[in-house]
Amino acid sequence: ALPAKPENISCVYYYRKNLTCTWSPGKETSYTQYTVKRTYAFGEKHDNCTTNSSTSENRASCSFFLPRITIPDNYTIEVEAENGDGVIKSHMTYWRLENIAKTEPPKIFRVKPVLGIKRMIQIEWIKPELAPVSSDLKYTLRFRTVNSTSWMEVNFAKNRKDKNQTYNLTGLQPFTEYVIALRCAVKESKFWSDWSQEKMGMTEEEAPCGLELWRVLKPAEADGRRPVRLLWKKARGAPVLEKTLGYNIWYYPESNTNLTETMNTTNQQLELHLGGESFWVSMISYNSLGKSPVATLRIPAIQEKSFQCIEVMQACVAEDQLVVKWQSSALDVNTWMIEWFPDVDSEPTTLSWESVSQATNWTIQQDKLKPFWCYNISVYPMLHDKVGEPYSIQAYAKEGVPSEGPETKVENIGVKTVTITWKEIPKSERKGIICNYTIFYQAEGGKGFSKTVNSSILQYGLESLKRKTSYIVQVMASTSAGGTNGTSINFKTLSFSVFE
């Protein structure tokens, strides 16, 4: 049979290297030789390129080399397939060389901030050594912060006569390290160079860009004063490398601004002892270049009633994230403060907090929380300067099987009945939320039975047992990841009862 007609012809001029055309050869059953027929020099010259490879993949491409390549130029390319049964020709294809030229990537040699110009870096590069002198080049510059994985891109062109191979990248974050890469193409071409090697550069430092402020209210002490733990951190979106030399804090009773107290600290939290009335707390951070904007927080009076609006809240794990969702009865509340800390018997030292706006859900990557640890999660509604009543739940980012089963006892042994009781597993051993308990029991040499009860139940009465029979019993505590058995206990039912 005749060879299949070559289809999908595609040509690339690897500038000053070769012009390579490829095609889809079709399913060849016998050896097929391909000849690429070319007219060039604007139709004034023609020649052929013949594939000489024995492997079928390599036979579907052919290259022309200098000096028989000129740019600009128009080519016609036709591929002829020949086997023992005859010759078949592809469609004639037409190519403008400047539309299919591909150059080497440019070389970035410097990325630097420009003194006194904020949030900008200047990229300097060398054009590819092999690039058409007669064509302008277009460029794509891609950039990302060092700790990000998503690239941003900017496109621009440079005139071929432009000696200044630089670009000023603006609108960046201050004092942030960026990764930069550059590629180029002949202005008329559809083929871009590969990306240049990446180069790093940092924007200039600025005054701190802001703070987020939160508090933990503690019960009033005997003298009526109330401890308030102030917590703060860099505002979201602040540069990772932003340096702070210290913090200025000032606070005063809402009713009397004249009673302002001020303090300085270099810590990231502070314990204040305030009176029972409402207070305003303000603070700024500073470095050698200036001060941040002021962050302000209102501390309610001890007897102040806070509003309630969260009706229901639930947590679930989805795609490597812990997701907390809630429903609110107050439509005007659109900011929420989330607090979370491990539920350990000692006082929580690692309180984490984060605000959420314009949403009634919060997500955190699973790997930011310890697996098999129970977390207390509280959501506070925030309306203007008021903080509402929190709604709290417990959740695990990842559940495991309990590391021990329940400690079990038997009580009230009768002729046909017995009461099995067990203790809750200690928090540290649960590894998940206990969803149920299963009681397994079996008469000596007999069939086994089981009964599952919900997690609020810590005892269960077994009935319809055989008189004067030895039984073995065991309680299993289960989380969503599976169950763990407690130790097994033996008991023997009575031979008769006092009521008989």
Epitope: K45, F65, L66, R68, T70, I71, E129, V133
Partner: antibody, heavy 121, light 107 residues
Framework: QVQLVQSGAEVKKPGASVKVSCKAS????????LNWVRQAPGQGLEWMGL????????DYNPQFQDRVTITADKSTSTAYMELSSLRSEDTAVYYC??????????????WGQGTLVTVSS | DIQMTQSPSSLSASVGDRVTITCQAS??????VAWYQQKPGKAPKLLIY???TEAQGVPSRFSGSGSGTDFTLTISSLQPEDFATYYC?????????FGGGTKVEIK
């Protein structure tokens, strides 16, 4: 800047061979074709052949086909022209010359300084 | 092979003169002609290619014209540094051939 530096003058006996080198600098060696042209004393220019250092492809003037070999060493950016079975009429200045224009193939834009080869018994 | 016939083989002219050198190809070579200038003891220098495109850095008094088989190099106003030998060359395809040269001397 683009430079082609050729090896020094040679004196050879008839029947011998001569190998002239041409070291390129200031550009990407594999991106341009190198030609060899000779000029006998008081005579015109005569093209001998070319090499594409990128793929080692050569093209020779049929007049020299059997006697000339042009090679290129990418690692040192150097091209060589070897002419064998020398006769007295091969006495000439031998030039290497690089092409330079995308739209002008087979044009000789940059030239070496020339190497005088004298063939004499 | 394509033959290039150049004329005249020599000419005498004065500074400021308009000088014309012609070259004839033995077959149609479209616009694939280059012109070179060579001074004694020096390598040739490319002046014009594609019959009429000036090479980089070449003074505008040098111009080329023609297509097919007949080509011309014109020096609009001869300068002292232009006294040299001029060669045409076809750059249609290999083998490349040169004209015999035209020596421009001071009158």
């Amino acid at each position: 800047q683009v430079q082609l530096v050729q090896s020094g003058a040679e004196v050879k006996k008839p029947g011998a061979s001569v190998k002239v080198s041409c070291k390129a600098s200031g550009y990407t060696f594999t991106g341009y074709v190198l030609n060899w042209v000779r000029q006998a004393p008081g005579q015109g220019l005569e093209w001998m052949g070319l090499i594409n250092p990128y793929n080692g492809g050569t093209d020779y003037n049929p007049q020299f086909q059997d006697r000339v070999t042009i090679t290129a060493d990418k690692s040192t950016s150097t091209a060589y022209m070897e002419l064998s079975s020398l006769r007295s009429e091969d006495t000439a200045v031998y030039y290497c010359a690089r092409d330079g224009y995308d739209d002008g193939p087979y044009t000789l834009e940059t030239w070496g300084q020339g190497t005088l080869v004298t063939v004499s018994s | 092979d394509i033959q290039m016939t150049q004329s005249p083989s020599s000419l005498s002219a004065s500074v400021g003169d308009r000088v014309t050198i012609t070259c004839q190809a033995s077959e149609d070579i479209y616009s694939f002609v280059a012109w070179y200038q060579q001074k004694p003891g020096k390598a040739p220098k490319l002046l014009i290619y594609n019959a009429q495109t000036e090479a980089q850095g070449v003074p505008s008094r040098f111009s080329g014209s023609g297509s097919g088989t007949d080509f011309t190099l014109t020096i609009s106003s001869l300068q002292p540094e232009d006294f040299a030998t001029y060669y045409c060359q076809h750059h249609y395809d290999s083998p490349l051939t040169f004209g015999g040269g035209t020596k421009v001397e001071i009158k």
